[in-house]
Amino acid sequence: LRLLDHRALVCSQPGLNCTVKNSTCLDDSWIHPRNLTPSSPKDLQIQLHFAHTQQGDLFPVAHIEWTLQTDASILYLEGAELSVLQLNTNERLCVRFEFLSKLRHHHRRWRFTFSHFVVDPDQEYEVTVHHLPKPIPDGDPNHQSKNFLVPDCEHARMKVTTPCMSSGSLWDPNITVETLEAHQLRVSFTLWNESTHYQILLTSFPHMENHSCFEHMHHIPAPRPEEFHQRSNVTLTLRNLKGCCRHQVQIQPFFSSCLNDCLRHSATVSCPEMPDTPEPIPDYMPLW
């Protein structure tokens, strides 16, 4: 988790002088509770937006938007703490909106936005907006939280973001797999425009089961420049095991931008259809 273009952060708007500050996620009002605290945010919305940095890189960002309730507690509102928690790592990042002037009611509902939390593809986050000061220990909560799921690099708009491109999202190997005679598979895929090696990982399974009955790894050396974007054809020999008929072929590239952590592509070959043969009817029925 990180912030985008830190020097560009602003939260001021007409009628409010405001500054964005780094936060430890532990506001002072936790330690020194106040008697009068503001009510919670209203209509918290989290959306996926896209941000180009100063240099021109493209990142997915969480666009956070909320409004204030139209009650007198805005007289005691000193700011807001925005917290983003990445659920699978428990990593948290916070910023604080610090109001440098008192809020007053005006003809429109107060509305705040922030679009500088960079998020990762295929990750889920919990976004919380806490109004400050935070409530006393037994006070009503004055925060709102929402979960936010970021699409993976297969998503058309995510594909061209810098983190996805770095993991090889623009490479479409267009894998084809065909079963040959004599227990062999022919795997064909399109090479990318980089002189890097690939690995084909073959895992075979019985018809209706998920534990593997055969595994094989095949190394493909780095192609020469004249082979870029060409098809690579590999024939894999399978183990002659009856019923070990469902094959998953996974291609792992080792691009310089992502090394061992590049996006993998896979294709699956299903077991051949069994003809529906009727159950044989016995000639006689035993009586015992």
């Epitope: 985008l4 273009d5 560009a8 959306q47 996926l48 937006h49 896209f50 941000a51 180009h52 940095t53 100063q54 240099q55 021109g56 890189d57 960002v61 666009h63 936005t113 679009s115 708009r157």
Partner: nanobody
């Protein structure tokens, strides 16, 4: 101070072409990614295209992909946008914008650093 001056707009028939230019001054041009944004009559700002600092990477909104081409000349401190196969829906005021920019899934601009005064492009028969 930062100055961005667009030029090259005009009236053109559907299917026609234009080349927009943006002369930049008051900052180190080659240190910043640059953008083109546009605003159709009665609409908000829409992001159109971006180019990174050395011109090696370009991005386009879906509606202009394959028709518009962004480029830059760092020696001349100038940003360009080549508009081909123009459609009536491309009618808008076109602005160049410096540095960071944020937009939503529909390319509506939500934050923008600095933009010029704009040049009008009208596509009509």
């Amino acid at each position: 101070q930062v100055q961005l001056q667009e030029s090259g707009g005009g009236l053109v028939q559907p299917g026609g072409s234009l080349r927009l230019s943006c002369a930049a001054s008051g900052f180190i041009f080659s240190n910043y990614g640059m953008n083109w944004v546009r605003q159709a009559p009665g609409k908000g700002l829409e992001w159109v295209s971006n180019i990174n600092i050395d011109g090696s990477r370009t991005f386009y909104a879906d509606s202009v992909k394959g028709r518009f081409t962004i480029s830059r000349d760092n020696a001349r401190n100038t940003l360009y946008l080549q508009l081909n196969s123009l459609r009536t829906e491309d009618t808008a005021m076109y602005y160049c914008a410096k540095g960071s920019i944020t937009y939503d899934m529909d390319y509506r601009v939500t934050t923008i650093e600095e933009k010029g005064q704009g040049t009008q492009v009208t596509v009509s028969s």
